[in-house]
Amino acid sequence: MMTGTIETTGNISAKKGGSVILQCHLSSTMAQVTQVNWEQHDHSLLAIRNAELGWHIYPAFKDRVAPGPGLGLTLQSLTMNDTGEYFCTYHTYPDGTYRGRIFLEVLESSVAEHSARFQIP
């Protein structure tokens, strides 16, 4: 039985050219997290964090994606094309798969909201 819940940064915004942290947190379960996958809006993989083998960043993103903090992901040098949905998928044992969603809006304006505590100035 899956008892866990995923908490995410929800809807966040950041400035073009800036950086942002995407963060998910799995709670209310004792399940072992074996892997966390981060996907972009088109469901292409950005990164994988395997519990035993560590981080793997998709080659096309290696200059703009940094692992962490924790199981989160830092996106750098943001462009308008980065606007959209991001998904964290927690693969766990014995529960199975948990999935969280974050919506990132990249703003041209310098008045980008600093709404999320995970945001990097």
């Epitope: 996958n37 395997n50 035993e52 083998l53 793997h56 960043i57």
Partner: antibody, heavy 121, light 108 residues
Amino acid sequence: QVQLVQSGAEVKKPGASVKVSCKASGYTFPAYYIHWVRQAPGQGLEWMGIINPSLGLTSYARKFQGRVTMTRDTSTSTVYMELSSLRSEDTAVYYCARGGRTTWIGALDIWGQGTMVTVSS
Amino acid sequence: EIVMTQSPATLSVSPGERATLSCRASQSVSSNLAWYQQKPGQAPRLLIYGASTRATGIPARFSGSGSGTEFTLTISSLQSEDFAVYYCQQYVVWPPLTFGGGTKVEIK
């Protein structure tokens, strides 16, 4: 050319251990994962685990945890798979295969010739 | 774990005909899917990776398609050397990486 050469066939008694070697040549040994896959007679392919030859990090299928150990010797570009507490169901051909670069993930593009392990009393 | 299901288990095709093999993942694997060919007494051989990219030296008659959970391997015109067992495999979540049960392509 790129190749993986495995050790020869083995016959073991139930309860014993077997250690199969896989020698890589023709490429930068530490840069690619090595996987172990087995195939029982007349059956499909079963993934056993993976080793990062650069760091020695391993990840094993839950089914084999506690019975399998994968190690490497970077000086000879050789990976080893040891399976203990053998039973008749472990009778199979054991393959090593090269996976993707250790910075990302990938399909198994180069396979060893296979090592037949027979467990019989 | 991600379960890979292949269909059909056996496919009977005449030489020169088209063969279509299916593979379904129990959850999305994006395009991180490979196809392998295995002949009796031999090690598997990589045919397709990234769901649709042919491996080095693989003839153009082999093509892969699909993304997410549904994938297809097509052999446009079967040659005598193509009769074999074909396996799909996801390589995005481990442990364990998982293979399908295989599809045997036999001569009709």
